[in-house]
């Protein structure tokens, strides 16, 4: 289970994101800064600092709007 305000690294971070974001998917860096394979974004925030549920949710992808 997700424990609020902790550090999450490696696979544990990925699995938690998958749980929080569900079918929406997620980005390793926020969409505003483009999806990138660079070691910044959520890894820096959640593994090397700490993160909570609200921060994790900001990395979820927004589902495409159906017309």
């Amino acid at each position: 289970a997700y424990r609020p305000s902790e550090t999450l690294c490696g696979g544990e971070l990925v699995d938690t994101l998958q749980f929080v974001c569900g079918d929406r998917g997620f980005y390793f860096s926020r969409p505003a800064s483009r999806v990138s394979r660079r070691s910044r974004g959520i890894v820096e925030e959640c593994c090397f600092r700490s993160c909570d549920l609200a921060l994790l949710e900001t990395y979820c992808a927004t589902p495409a709007k159906s017309e």
């Epitope: 550090t7 999450l8 690294c9 490696g10 696979g11 544990e12 699995d15 390793f28 394979r37 660079r38 070691s39 910044r40 890894v43 820096e44 593994c47 090397f48 600092r49």
Partner: antibody
Framework: EVQLLESGGGLVQPGGSLRLSCAAS????????MAWVRQAPGKGLEWVSS????????KYADSVKGRFTISRDNSKNTLYLQMNSLRAEDTAVYYC?????????????WGQGTMVTVSS | DIQMTQSPSSLSASVGDRVTITCRAS??????LNWYQQKPGKAPKVLIH???TLESGVPSRFSGSGSATEFTLTISSLQPEDFATFYC?????????FGPGTRLSSK
């Protein structure tokens, strides 16, 4: 060619200090998490420390916390490990390694290692 | 911390043999498991990441499988250059821990 080259190892007395360097080439150093991994003589591998790409945040193994400091200079493509209050159990080959952060956190590039011997 | 164990700790085999090494984690790590090969006096080299993904340039005789707590590295037909020590490493959570190693020597 992707390469990491460590330097700075040597013989030091217990309680002493040493600074290791790792020069990176062949990849965009500033984009990757980097780490130090060590191996005591005849023993297995032990993760020591990691540093985020920007250099602003770090992680340490409990065995070195408060004694070792990892840092990096992205303008020089160089990773450092400052080792203080050294103990006999810190004797090991120290490797710097590049972290495949979004592909399973494996260490996909390693240096040749530098030997640190702590002895009186 | 997650503890990693390997079996056997050492084994002897002949060129052409099929060899299997097992790695176990003290808790579930999904498929966040990497395998390394290390030859004497050399740095480790990653063979497989994410339990089963072969690294670029690694011969296809190496394969990995498993999930949760039990993983295997298989060499389908042992070659002379394969004799070395093999380590597993979990990348599920920090500290990223390694197994104690399996030394593969010539029979």
């Amino acid at each position: 060619e992707v390469q990491l080259l460590e330097s700075g190892g040597g013989l030091v007395q217990p309680g002493g200090s040493l600074r290791l360097s790792c020069a990176a080439s062949g990849f965009t150093f500033s984009e990757y998490v980097m780490a130090w991994v060590r191996q005591a003589p005849g023993k297995g591998l032990e993760w020591v420390s990691s540093i985020v790409s920007s250099g602003g945040y770090t992680k340490y193994a409990d065995s070195v916390k408060g004694r070792f400091t990892i840092s990096r200079d992205n303008s020089k493509n160089t990773l450092y490990l400052q080792m203080n209050s050294l103990r006999a159990e810190d004797t090991a080959v120290y490797y710097c390694a590049k972290d495949m952060t979004y592909s399973g956190d494996a260490f996909d590039v390693w240096g040749q290692g530098t030997m640190v011997t702590v002895s009186s | 911390d997650i503890q990693m164990t390997q079996s056997p700790s050492s084994l002897s085999a002949s060129v052409g043999d099929r060899v299997t090494i097992t790695c176990r984690a003290s808790q579930s790590i999904n498929t966040y498991l990497n395998w390394y090969q290390q030859k004497p006096g050399k740095a480790p080299k990653v063979l497989i990441h994410a339990a089963s993904t072969l690294e670029s340039g690694v011969p296809s005789r190496f394969s990995g499988s498993g999930s949760a707590t039990e993983f295997t590295l298989t060499i389908s037909s042992l070659q002379p250059e394969d004799f070395a020590t093999f380590y597993c490493q979990q990348s599920y959570s920090v500290p990223f821990t390694f197994g104690p190693g399996t030394r593969l020597s010539s029979k």
